[in-house]
Interface confidence: medium
Amino acid sequence: KLLQVSTIAMQQQEKLIQQERALLNFTEWKRSCALQMKYCQAFMQNSLSSAHNSSPCPNNWIQNRESCYYVSEIWSIWHTSQENCLKEGSTLLQIESKEEMDFITGSLRKIKGSYDYWVGLSQDGHSGRWLWQDGSSPSPGLLPAERSQSANQVCGYVKSNSLLSSNCSTWKYFICEKYALRSSV
C-alpha cells in the first residue's frame, strides 16, 4: 500500500511539473503576443499616418533602404523609450545585419558623437537570452558585450560602434525605427 501511495505521489509531482512548464510556456507566449500586437499597431499607425505623405520617411527621420530611423534628442529609461517610439508608429531600433549596424553607427558619429542610445534589445529574465522586441533572437555577431553587472533587468544600447548592455532603468538617448513608405510612382 505504501508503494502505491508513493507511486501516486510521484505521478502527481510529475503532473505538477508539466503544468508549471505549460504555464511558463503560456506566459512566454502571452508576452510574445502582447509585443506582436504592439508591433502590428505601430505598423498600422505608421501606414495610415504616412498615407497622406509622399516622402518615404517623416521629417527629421533618416532613411536607409526600407527603414526610417529617428535619433531622439531626449533621455529616457528603456521602457519609456519603447513607449515613445510606439507613439510615433515605430519601435525601438532592431538591428538585423552588420550593414545596418554600420549605417547606424556612421550616422550617429555625424549627428551626435559617442553617446548611449537604447535599442530594442532586452535580456529575458528567466533564460538570460537576448531578444529583440518582436521576440526574435539577435544574430551571433550582434550580441551585446557583457558589460552590465546589474541585478535588475538588462537592456541593449549602441555606443560608438559597439552594442553594449546596461540596467534598463538608466537614462539614455534612443533610436526608433519604422518601415519607409514605398513610392507609388
Epitope: N60, S72, E73, I74, K87
Partner: nanobody
Framework: QVQLVESGGGSVQAGGSLRLSCAAS????????MAWSRQAPGKEREFVAR????????DYADSVKGRFTISRDNAKNTVYLQMNSLKPEDTAIYYC??????????SGQGTQVTVSS
C-alpha cells in the same frame, strides 16, 4: 519659439550649494517633462535630473542622487536645480532642456558652475 534662460551658476567651494533657475518664455512648459544636463570640459553632455510636467515624478543621475533636487513652479514657468554638497567633479556648464519627444530639443545657453577644492 520657446526660449530657455538658465541662471544661478557661479564659483563655489567644495561642500557649498547653488540654486540654478531655468525660465521659459514663448511656451507654457507645464505640459512637458523638463531636464537638467551638464557638460564638463572635454566630456560628453550628461543627464543630471528630470521632472515630470506636474512635478510629481523626478529622476536623477546616480552621481548626483541625494545631493541635487529638481523642482518646478509652473505658475512662473520656471524649473530649478538645488545643488548641495558640491564636488569639484560637478564643475560644468549646466543646461536646461524641454523633454518633448518628436520635436526639436529646446535647450538654453547654459550657466557655468565651478567648484574648487
Amino acid at each position: 519659439q520657446v526660449q530657455l534662460v538658465e541662471s544661478g551658476g557661479g564659483s563655489v567651494q567644495a561642500g557649498g550649494s547653488l540654486r540654478l533657475s531655468c525660465a521659459a518664455s514663448g511656451r507654457t512648459i507645464s505640459n512637458y517633462d523638463m531636464a537638467w544636463s551638464r557638460q564638463a570640459p572635454g566630456k560628453e553632455r550628461e543627464f543630471v535630473a528630470r521632472i515630470s510636467g506636474s512635478g510629481d515624478r523626478t529622476d536623477y543621475a546616480d552621481s548626483v542622487k541625494g545631493r541635487f533636487t529638481i523642482s518646478r513652479d509652473n505658475a512662473k514657468n520656471t524649473v530649478y536645480l538645488q545643488m548641495n554638497s558640491l564636488k569639484p567633479e560637478d564643475t560644468a556648464i549646466y543646461y536646461c532642456q524641454i523633454q518633448d519627444f518628436g520635436s526639436p530639443s529646446f535647450s538654453g545657453q547654459g550657466t557655468q558652475v565651478t567648484v574648487s577644492s
